[in-house]
Interface confidence: medium
């Protein structure tokens, strides 16, 4: 570590005296600059010497010497006071810039340590400090305003009592800059714009920032627009607003508009698209299939997406039949606006009843005309089964009728014993009817099919079961013969062994 002679840490001299400061180290040493022109600097082997033949109050400051080759980076310092009876202060800088909440050092150095007891900080021309100004003083460094606030950006003077009289330093201007958290906040209104050729349009680009030092511009595609700027200040933020007003739009006005704002922290931009059309439009679409199938008792939401300009003048859901003349309840119809020109309309159909199957149409109107989108709703039902014993062409026949949607398929089972339902262990024979006869198949209604099992003799201690199933469920009907003597003759193509 280098050593300074005289040993210090402080040296007090009078103006006009000669001052010599010698720094000695193991290797080469140097004085931390900048050294004022009043000093002469020369090297003498491993030492460096600063000397002045005519010390002035402006030589008052801390002189530090370092040894560049020292791996520990040690340094030595001495503080020189040149106590001028007329000059209590040496001001090292007339402007100090800090960010809010940083400590601000006002570098007025006292030229005579004896005066320390009578120092104070005032604003220019002896005005008192603002309330809540928290400061401290160091004779080596000056006044420190702790955690400086924006409002404390003022002109200050350092004051010292000399012979009962306050003597001021020259003024120091403190600038306290607001901490800019990021690029300016932006809004571009509207987020999307559609106009018919010849209509008027307005696009507003506004930016706000914590201080006034920021720029904002509006760009159309790649062209920067020259628009007058309106400025304002509210909510502790500076606002800059650019308004593009177009009296009669044409196709060349269409395209991408970007609002761009920048400050010291960077740039922020947001964009919108302006579409110019020849005439009004109204488009209806759905992400759903227009043909819907739902199990009876369940619910369904029918959704229609609408894209329109100008806005809708009317819309409604209509039930087109074929069953009752009921209409959807308004409370079940819901409209949501995704943005200015796109809307979603939903019809909620909870716990669907048989009479609610059929066609549902969404109709909408704007100056471009009427449009409609129709859904076809078919209800699914699990099969309902019934078996009767009848004679057809003199032959005894089991007749199974199954009704449901989708169309049920039919299986016959013969099993041992009397039972309500055949289980696997009891099954003696199974017949699958590949083509049951369709008795009725009307739109939006159940499909009814019929399957025949011709019986010559029915075994007395056996059960004959007709089973029907579809994607919704299954149903069955067991038939137990009352008298013996008949035998069954299923068609050949029906027969298989389980």
């Amino acid at each position: 570590i280098p050593v300074i002679e005289p040993s210090g840490p402080e040296l007090v001299v009078k103006p006009g005296e000669t001052v010599t400061l010698r720094c000695v180290g193991n290797g080469s040493v140097e004085w931390d600059g900048p050294i004022s022109p009043h000093w002469t600097l020369y090297s003498d082997g491993p030492s460096s010497v600063l000397t002045t033949n005519n010390a002035t109050f402006q030589n008052t400051r801390t002189y530090r010497c370092t040894e560049p080759g020292d791996p520990l980076g040690g340094s030595a310092a001495i503080h020189l006071y040149v106590k001028d009876p007329a000059r209590p202060w040496n001001v090292l800088a007339k402007e100090v810039v800090v960010f809010e909440d940083q400590d601000a050092l006002l570098p007025c150095l006292l030229t005579d340590p004896v005066l320390e007891a009578g120092v104070s900080l005032v604003r220019l021309r002896g005005r008192p400090l603002l309330r809540h100004t928290n400061y401290s003083f160091s004779p080596w460094h000056g006044f420190i305003i702790h955690r400086a606030k924006f409002i404390q950006g003022q002109d200050y003077q350092c004051s010292a009592l000399m012979g009962g009289r306050k003597v001021m330093s020259i003024s120091i201007r403190l600038k306290v800059q607001k901490v800019i958290p990021g690029p300016p906040a932006l809004t571009l209104v509207p987020a999307e714009l559609v106009r018919i050729r010849g209509e008027a349009a307005q696009i507003v680009c506004s930016a706000s920032n914590i201080d006034v030092d920021f720029d904002v511009f509006l760009q159309h595609n790649t062209t920067k627009l020259a628009i007058p700027q309106r400025s304002d200040f509210h909510d502790n933020r500076y606002q800059k607003v650019l308004t593009l007003s177009l009296g009669q739009v044409d196709f060349q006005h269409a395209g991408n508009y970007s609002c761009v704002a920048s400050n010291v922290q960077g740039k922020h931009s947001t964009s919108m698209f302006f579409r110019v059309v020849e005439s009004a439009y109204l488009d209806l679409s759905s992400e759903q299939n227009l043909i819907q199938e739902v199990t009876v008792g369940e619910g369904l939401n029918l959704k229609v997406m609408v894209e329109a300009y100008p806005g809708l003048q009317g819309f409604n859901w209509t039930y087109l039949g074929p069953f009752s003349d009921h209409q959807p309840e308004p409370k079940l119809a819901n409209a949501t606006t995704k943005d200015t020109y796109r809307h979603t309309f939903t019809l909620s159909l909870p716990r669907l009843k048989p009479s609610e199957a059929g066609r549902y149409s969404f109709l909408a109107r704007n100056p471009g005309g009427w449009r409609a989108l129709t859904f076809e709703l078919t209800l699914r039902y699990p099969p309902e089964v019934s078996v009767i014993w009848t004679s057809i062409n003199g032959s005894g026949t089991l007749l199974c009728a199954a009704s449901g949607y989708p169309q049920p398929n039919v299986t016959w089972l013969q099993c041992a014993g009397h039972t309500d339902r055949c289980d696997e262990a009891q099954v003696l024979q199974v017949w699958v009817d590949p083509h049951p006869e369709v008795l009725s198949q009307e739109p939006f209604q159940k499909v009814t099919v019929q399957s025949l099992l011709t019986a010559e003799t029915l075994e007395h201690n056996q059960t004959y079961e007709c089973r029907a199933h579809n994607s919704v469920g299954s149903g069955s009907w067991a038939f137990i013969p009352i008298s013996a003597g008949a035998r069954t003759h299923p068609p050949d193509e029906f027969l298989f062994t389980p």
Epitope: K94, L124, I170, R173, K175
Partner: antibody, heavy 122, light 111 residues
Framework: QVQLVQSGAEVKKPGSSVKVSCKAS????????IIWVRQAPGQGLEWMGD????????NYAQKFQGRVTITADESTSTAYMELSSLRSEDTAVYYC???????????????WGQGTLVTVSS | EIVLTQSPATLSLSPGERATLSCRAS??????????LAWYQQKPGQAPRLLIY???NRATGIPARFSGSGSGTDFTLTISSLEPEDFAVYYC?????????FGGGTKVEIK
């Protein structure tokens, strides 16, 4: 080029108030103090007060303390001087001036407004 | 409070002549090697115009015939050769400490 444009001449009754505006263009408004100076007919220049537009803090000459209010709107780059309880001796040309960028020497006025004549008469 | 006294109150000269205007401060306006004094020119019906700051530095665009000198309490504005447009009132101003004060002015008129 920096320009300071002041509001037009005013005729006021004694006891009333006057508010003079000074709009700056062509420079960074917040960087320099705005200083108000007045000049009575045939008289010299008299400092009234000043404002730091950067944070809105104003200083007033002792003579005008309590009667003058200096404000600045950084968003429109405009400074205002309002003088209340007017009397006939307040008849003067009121100037706004901008402090120059001479950091070694604060309160040197390098740009001036054209002046606003305020006449106080009953 | 520092008072600035200008003399003479009126100076009658012809174009081409040298004008010497004085400004005296009631106490020193120099500090740390700087002189806190400025000079302004004012023509009838116009706003003042900055000529000199720091006692001797010419402001932007000011012709070389205008020069300032002095330190401490005594300051001088010199116009080496008067042009017709130089006939006006000249004010000195204390530009840093205490009050922002002006001298009473010196009128330079055509003889």
């Amino acid at each position: 080029q920096v320009q300071l444009v002041q509001s037009g001449a005013e005729v006021k009754k004694p006891g009333s108030s006057v508010k003079v505006s000074c709009k700056a263009s062509g420079g960074t408004f917040s960087s320099y103090y705005i200083i108000w100076v007045r000049q009575a007919p045939g008289q010299g220049l008299e400092w009234m007060g000043d404002i730091n537009p950067y944070n809105g803090t104003a200083n007033y000459a002792q003579k005008f303390q309590g009667r003058v209010t200096i404000t600045a709107d950084e968003s429109t780059s405009t400074a205002y001087m309002e003088l209340s309880s007017l009397r006939s001796e307040d008849t003067a040309v009121y100037y706004c001036a901008r402090e120059g960028p001479y950091f070694s020497n604060l309160y040197v006025m390098d740009y001036w407004g054209q002046g606003t004549l305020v006449t106080v008469s009953s | 409070e520092i008072v600035l006294t200008q003399s003479p109150a009126t100076l009658s000269l012809s174009p081409g002549e040298r004008a010497t205007l004085s400004c005296r401060a009631s106490q020193s306006v120099s500090y740390q090697g700087e002189n806190y004094l400025a000079w302004y020119q004012q023509k009838p019906g116009q706003a003042p115009r900055l000529l000199i700051y720091d006692a001797s530095n010419r402001a932007t665009g000011i012709p070389a015939r205008f020069s300032g000198s002095g330190s401490g309490t005594d300051f001088t504005l010199t116009i080496s050769s008067l042009e017709p447009e130089d006939f006006a009132v000249y004010y000195c101003q204390l530009s840093n400490q205490d009050l922002l004060t002006f001298g009473g002015g010196t009128k330079v008129e055509i003889k």
